[in-house]
Interface confidence: low
């Protein structure tokens, strides 16, 4: 499948609109600080060049790889060293090292201003004045803040973003129509970004084998009627797609994702009965729909797993002949029978099975040695079940905000060295597991909860990797991908932590808190809670609750006062003094 000109090939496959959008995403994900206008200029230059290659694939430079073409273009940015510092050194390297260098400089937490949403009329005017620029700006702003966002999926978000403005800017009540849609896109976008970040971390930190194992388990749950060979083919193709996107090869990724969707729809009879509706949709919607499709029903006549994987005298022979294929079959067979298990649990079971075979197939009596291997699974299954049961009970008792606060305290005590904004962000997201998953029946709780927690804990891991401050976080993040959550769950209070010095400024609040949204006000209060725990890690739940209740009452009182600022100054001092006394600071 060699093409004389790769850039011409991708331009023709994807079409001009998608080509330009994907190049913009790629450039914004690499050079996250560059102004929008600079990126648009670079994209236009690349697009014009691609058109010359479409016209004549033998034209000068058309035979160059996409990395070479894109890298050369990025390295023409005049302010590279001033803006990006050592990232400019990447430009002295040759491909493929140059691209690897750019990838290593992607920043998960770029120092960019928060996106502030303008008034609806202002947005609608901008949309009508120049729709193309308006939508490009959306792609640019999301891509630079989320450098691992799944590019073909971002095209789908942009399509929905455009549809929202097209519909709502004509509506009688523009705001009522538009704002809920934008909120939904924002929340879904954050979730999509975090899920993709875990896929990229899995590939980049733990390798292709780890990603393939995850994919075997998930696709086997989703397509339990598909044969192992079919699932294996889908896993191979899916791995290629995500390897490309995580590696910055966005044109190839989008092209291959479209091919995979086409294959799945052409072969849905041997994959899943749930794909019919998805396959009737246009390309971007189709790919999204397939990625989110519900699990098919389990086949009726699945035999006992024990026959092939425990009772058979050929277990060690089969394992020795093709270890990864045999383990893949085990994972496939176990996962298709267990839509009620999280993917990470299934991977832990497969790891336990692999470890047992490694040990037993070298023993004098292998069968005797591995005969009880399924008994070892019981505690592994019960641990997340019990944890989810306890936490859902706590969530139902406390509600989301107070449940988040309980987790804030829990995680601050475990890893108090982590920055306060990171602890607040991660704990708030951990707390959302309650409203997201506890409503489900038991059969859906574990896959919902534990796989979601894997995504959130990966956020902690990638943010911590940028500025490592805690050996415990590093250990949990790097030792085992599938045991990250149990590792963090097992952490107790960090007894080595030296409490933070008390700083009254941290607990000084102003009248501006009164105009904040409920969410922003919660974040302020939760920030204060983390700081309290960092000052007094041994504070009891009751002490912390008392202080937080006083704090909430103080904010409410001063926000109702005529002279708010004076109230915050005077009452704030009293609150700090009372809190210090209550906590023995």
């Amino acid at each position: 499948d060699a093409h004389k000109s790769e850039v011409a090939h991708r331009f023709k496959d994807l079409g001009e609109e998608n080509f330009k959008a994907l190049v913009l995403i790629a450039f914004a994900q690499y050079l996250q600080q560059c102004p929008f206008e600079d990126h648009v200029k670079l994209v236009n230059e690349v697009t014009e060049f691609a058109k010359t290659c479409v016209a004549d694939e033998s034209a000068e430079n058309c035979d160059k790889s996409l990395h070479t073409l894109f890298g050369d273009k990025l390295c023409t940015v005049a302010t590279l060293r001033e803006t990006y510092g050592e990232m400019a050194d990447c430009c002295a390297k040759q491909e493929p090292e140059r691209n690897e260098c750019f990838l290593q400089h992607k920043d998960d937490n770029p120092n960019l201003p928060r996106l502030v949403r303008p008034e609806v009329d202002v947005m609608c005017t901008a949309f009508h004045d120049n729709e193309e620029t308006f939508l490009k700006k959306y792609l640019y702003e999301i891509a630079r803040r989320h450098p691992y966002f799944y590019a073909p999926e971002l095209l789908f978000f942009a399509k929905r973003y455009k549809a929202a403005f097209t519909e709502c800017c004509q509506a009688a009540d523009k705001a009522a129509c538009l704002l809920p849609k934008l909120d939904e896109l924002r929340d879904e976008g954050k979730a999509s970004s975090a899920k993709q970040r875990l896929k990229c971390a899995s590939l980049q930190k733990f390798g292709e084998r780890a990603f393939k194992a995850w994919a075997v388990a998930r696709l086997s749950q989703r397509f339990p009627k598909a044969e192992f060979a079919e699932v294996s083919k889908l896993v191979t193709d899916l791995t290629k797609v995500h390897t490309e996107c995580c590696h910055g090869d966005l044109l190839e990724c989008a092209d291959d994702r479209a091919d995979l969707a086409k294959y799945i729809c052409e072969n849905q009879d041997s994959i899943s009965s749930k794909l019919k509706e998805c396959c009737e949709k246009p390309l971007l919607e189709k790919s999204h729909c397939i990625a989110e499709v519900e699990n098919d029903e389990m086949p009726a006549d699945l035999p006992s797993l024990a026959a092939d994987f425990v009772e058979s005298k050929d277990v060690c022979k089969n394992y020795a002949e093709a270890k990864d294929v045999f383990l893949g079959m085990f994972l496939y067979e176990y996962a298709r029978r267990h839509p009620d298990y999280s993917v990470v649990l299934l991977l832990r079971l497969a790891k336990t099975y692999e470890t047992t075979l490694e040990k037993c197939c070298a023993a004098a009596d292998p069968h005797e040695c591995y005969a009880k291997v399924f008994d070892e699974f019981k505690p592994l299954v019960e641990e997340p079940q019990n944890l989810i049961k306890q936490n859902c009970e706590l969530f139902e008792q406390l509600g989301e905000y107070k449940f988040q606060n309980a987790l804030l305290v829990r995680y601050t005590k475990k890893v108090p060295q982590v920055s306060t904004p990171t602890l607040v962000e991660v704990s708030r997201n951990l707390g959302k597991v309650g409203s997201k998953c506890c409503k489900h029946p038991e059969a859906k709780r574990m896959p919902c909860a534990e796989d979601y927690l894997s995504v959130v804990l990966n956020q902690l891991c990638v943010l911590h990797e940028k500025t490592p401050v805690s050996d415990r976080v590093t250990k949990c993040c790097t030792e085992s991908l599938v045991n990250r959550r149990p590792c963090f769950s097992a952490l107790e209070v960090d007894e080595t932590y030296v409490p933070k010095e008390f700083n009254a400024e941290t607990f000084t609040f102003h009248a501006d808190i009164c105009t904040l949204s409920e969410k922003e006000r919660q974040i302020k209060k939760q920030t204060a809670l983390v700081e309290l725990v960092k000052h007094k890690p041994k504070a009891t739940k009751e002490q912390l609750k008392a202080v937080m209740d006083d704090f909430a009452a103080f904010v409410e009182k001063c926000c109702k006062a005529d002279d708010k600022e004076t109230c915050f100054a005077e009452e704030g001092k009293k609150l700090v003094a009372a809190s210090q006394a209550a906590l023995g600071l």
Partner: nanobody
Framework: EVQLLESGGGLVQPGGSLRLSCAAS????????MSWVRQAPGKGPEWVSA????????RYAESVKGRFTISRDNSKNTLYLQMNSLRPEDTAVYYC????????GSQGTLVTVSS
Amino acid sequence: EVQLLESGGGLVQPGGSLRLSCAASGFTFGSFGMSWVRQAPGKGPEWVSAIDSGGADTRYAESVKGRFTISRDNSKNTLYLQMNSLRPEDTAVYYCTIGRSASRGSQGTLVTVSS
């Protein structure tokens, strides 16, 4: 704890009918395929019929095809086996199982077909 409780067995004449029920508890019934298995006196277990978790896909052993019908009611966590045109060779202890695995310790219900 997984529990499967069969009922509906009894003595019936050849050509007669019976409806067996299996009440399930201790697991998420609606997520699993289920089967009926029978064991005649002095013989090993024989798989009779299976149904997928949603109830759309059903399978039967050749010996019962056209006479037996498997069904389920996920809202009641119950599996059924409607047995028509019964024959003496259908005499056995019938028990329900999860998937197509061996018995999960259920007691079974005795079906005797005799004139």
